[in-house]
């Protein structure tokens, strides 16, 4: 990998080994300055593989609210507006990092956690494997 | 919101105000124990709105590698396997949290950052607004 010289102005850290504890500033910097907050919010209705959004709330997690997509149909919407069951609506999943309060209920101590979330749905050609 | 009693075993924190600095254990806990590592990895080819995945690497960010989806076509693949340009392939975007080294090049000091990533593509019916 790329070796970067350590900045002499870095805060001290007692534990240099993994699992390592680091200092994190929770004042979020948002790099999405050039995007409309509406973003992809209407795709869930306009897509040929539409989905519903479900609110997942967990006060022990940061962010505490995550929206999960659930495909509306097994098939995909065709040109006539009907569901075509020769195609499949499937969720696009992504692994994201969240902060989990550890020990529980502590406001200033977290552990990184990887969770899988469904972001939206896409229409795919089904693959069938003959097993016998 | 939900008020949770503070755990008496929590680490001390000097700064109780935002922007607040918290302790984060980087030993990632993966809750996706029951998922296939392949997950949606082949959807990018099988979708009616296929996409390519581009590697975005930044050593000052954690995670340092993020994969970005770029739709292959302006239109969507129809039942005949041709691209239908009356429909649109569009990227499904999601805001995710990452850690940004701050000050730069420091191994143990980070700031939370929100970035927008394209996770995959979906096929939508275009909407046209007449502006004049």
């Amino acid at each position: 990998g790329i070796t970067i010289p350590r900045n002499p102005g870095c805060p001290n850290s007692e534990d240099k080994n993994f699992p390592r504890t680091v200092m994190v500033n929770l004042n979020i910097h948002n790099r999405n300055t050039n995007t409309n907050p509406k973003r992809s919010s209407d795709y869930y209705n306009r897509s040929t593989s539409p989905w519903n959004l479900h609110r997942n709330e967990d006060p022990e997690r940061y962010p505490s609210v995550i929206w999960e997509a659930k495909c509306r149909h097994l098939g995909c919407i065709n040109a006539d507006g009907n569901v075509d069951y020769h195609m499949n609506s499937v969720p696009i999943q992504q692994e994201i990092l969240v902060l989990r309060r550890e020990p529980p209920h502590c406001p200033n101590s977290f552990r990184l956690e990887k969770i899988l979330v469904s972001v939206g749905c896409t229409c795919v050609t089904p693959i069938v494997h003959h097993v016998a | 919101g939900i008020t949770i009693p503070r755990n008496p075993g929590c680490p001390n924190s000097e700064d109780k105000n935002f922007p607040r600095t918290v302790m984060v254990n980087l030993n990632i806990h993966n809750r996706n124990t029951n998922t296939n590592p392949k997950r949606s990895s082949d959807y990018y080819n099988r979708s009616t709105s296929p996409w390519n995945l581009h590697r975005n690497e930044d050593p000052e960010r954690y995670p340092s590698v993020i994969w970005e989806a770029k739709c292959r076509h302006l239109g969507c693949i129809n039942a005949d396997g041709n691209v239908d340009y009356h429909m649109n392939s569009v990227p499904i975007q999601q805001e995710i949290l990452v850690l940004r080294r701050e000050p730069p090049h420091c191994p143990n000091s980070f700031r939370l950052e929100k970035i927008l990533v394209s996770v995959g593509c979906t096929c939508v019916t275009p909407i046209v607004h007449h502006v004049a």
């Epitope: 992809s40 | 739709c71 569009v90 990227p91 046209v128 607004h129 007449h130």
Partner: nanobody, 122 residues
Framework: EVQLVESGGGLVQPGGSLRLSCAAS????????MYWVRQAPGKGLEWISA????????YYADSVNGRFTISRDNAENLLYLQMNSLKSEDTAVYYC???????????????GGQGTQVTVSS
């Protein structure tokens, strides 16, 4: 107020060339994806080309790929479509459109609606 005004169409023989222009105003042109859309007689709108805000990322319909080139001048708020090796099936009204949302492609568009007629005939 968003305004998109197309020009440059006309009658051309098969194999000929045309350069379409679109003058944009009323929005921050350099922040939006821009598109060329065409409508052949009796057909629906067909998205034939798209160009990212910075100009580095372009899309083309298979039917025009290799013959048409989309470009933009962000300083002058102009979008172009260079059309070479024109065919009779390219006959249509050509419209310039902008994405409805800033920054990326959403499949939602604003267009001026006047268009410029391109007729390819011998």
């Amino acid at each position: 107020e968003v305004q998109l005004v197309e020009s440059g169409g006309g009658l051309v023989q098969p194999g000929g060339s045309l350069r379409l222009s679109c003058a944009a105003s009323g929005f921050t042109f350099s922040s939006y994806w821009m598109y060329w859309v065409r409508q052949a007689p009796g057909k629906g709108l067909e998205w034939i080309s798209a160009l990212a805000p910075g100009g580095g990322n372009a899309y083309y319909a298979d039917s025009v790929n290799g013959r048409f080139t989309i470009s933009r001048d962000n300083a002058e708020n102009l979008l172009y479509l260079q059309m070479n090796s024109l065919k009779s099936e390219d006959t249509a009204v050509y419209y310039c459109a902008k994405d409805h949302n800033v920054g990326y492609r959403t499949g939602e568009y604003d267009y001026g609606g006047q268009g410029t007629q391109v007729t390819v005939s011998s």
